[in-house]
């Protein structure tokens, strides 16, 4: 049975050119963690492998970077990034979790500064 | 196509040391793992380890510990396996193959080698 | 580590029969089970994946079944070039661990 929940950063903005941390918190299993994904869309931006550990898809390397722990980061955004971001645990033996952030890219300072997760 | 391509047969005396190439091509060798399993002489498959081309990162089965090395060379697209402290019991075919799926990482081969035999005899 | 026991270990069948496979986990790996078919002196051949999932050019009379801890390959109607040795093997953690085996004669 899942018993587990996923926490995320929920809905968060950022300012276009910035940087942002995409953070998600696996809790309330015993559930070993065998990878995490993190996804935009249908497109694989990182893995994080527990054995192996981060692999970034070549496409995303100069915007992404592994961590905090298993979040991600993602710099120098643009506008284009705005949209919904999927931070997938795969456990044994509970099977898959998946959390879901919203990130919206501003044009201007109009972005919160309060997010918990965000750069500066 | 997808093509592994590994060194030729080995034949080695026990204490020895032997590495096992294998040459990638038809896709993005940083963009796969890949496994080494070997097969003894009328015997079934048994995982040696895994590799991450892209980090170098490994992972070995515990039965191998301390007598393997796993190793990458991005600029030839070629992993290698090296085993030493070689006994009779290490006779056997030693194939590379490449995981499946980076967003399942390490957890099934779908292209393989075809296989090296290292003979360890005294 | 998870071990896997496949039965039979050896089946002797003729061609247009219907032979299955069984491969059990020691514990629940869900649906993540491979079966590979080797042939001799050739490298392994991944058939199917997800436990049931035909891998691309994989002919439809091969199938697969099962979640949990029991699995089953059944080959609906054996052809002469299904004569092989197939292996079962757990995909849902590291290391990765096979069965042992079963090979397919021709009676």
């Known amino acids: 049975m899942m018993t587990g929940t996923i926490e995320t950063t929920g809905n968060i903005s950022a300012e276009k050119g910035g940087s942002i941390i995409l953070q998600c918190h696996l809790s309330s299993t015993t559930a070993q963690v065998t990878q995490v994904n993190w996804e935009q869309q249908d497109q694989l931006l990182a893995i994080c492998n527990a054995d192996l550990g981060w692999h970034i898809s070549p496409s995303f390397k100069d915007r992404v970077a592994p961590g905090p722990g298993l979040g991600l980061t993602l710099q120098s955004l643009t506008v284009n990034d705005t949209g919904e971001y999927f931070c997938i645990y795969h456990t044994y033996p509970d099977g898959t979790y998946t959390g879901r952030i919203f990130l919206e890219v501003l044009e201007s300072s109009v972005a919160e500064h309060g997010a918990r997760f965000q750069i500066p | 196509q997808v093509q592994l391509v590994q060194s030729g047969a080995e034949v080695k005396k026990p204490g020895a040391s032997v590495k096992v190439s294998c040459k990638a091509s038809?896709?993005?060798?940083?963009?796969?793992?890949m496994h080494w399993v070997r097969q003894a002489p009328g015997q079934g498959l048994e995982w040696m380890g895994i590799?991450?081309?892209?980090?170098?990162?490994?992972k070995y089965a515990q039965k191998f510990q301390g007598r393997v090395t796993m190793t990458r060379d991005t600029s030839t697209s070629t992993v290698y396996m090296e085993l030493s402290s070689l006994r009779s019991e290490d006779t056997a075919v030693y194939y590379c193959?490449?995981?499946?799926?980076?967003?399942?990482?390490?957890?099934?081969?779908?292209?393989w080698g075809q296989g090296t035999l290292v003979t360890v005899s005294s | 580590d998870i071990q896997m026991t496949q039965s039979p270990s050896s089946v002797s069948a003729s061609v247009g029969d219907r032979v299955t496979i069984t491969c059990r986990a020691s514990?629940?790996?869900?649906?993540?089970l491979a079966w590979y078919q080797q042939k001799p002196g050739k490298a392994p051949k991944l058939l199917i994946s997800a436990a049931s999932s035909l891998q691309s050019g994989v002919p439809s009379r091969f199938s697969g079944s099962g979640s949990g801890t029991d699995f089953t390959l059944t080959i609906s109607s054996l052809q002469p070039e299904d004569f092989a040795t197939y292996y079962c093997q757990q995909a849902v953690i590291l290391p990765i661990t096979f069965g042992g085996g079963t090979k397919v004669e021709i009676k």
């Open positions: 193959a490449r995981d499946h799926d980076i967003r399942l990482a390490g957890r099934l081969a779908d292209y």
């Open positions: 590799i991450s081309p892209s980090a170098g990162s490994t």
């Open positions: 038809g896709y993005t060798f940083t963009e796969y793992y």
């Open positions: 514990q629940g790996i869900s649906s993540w």
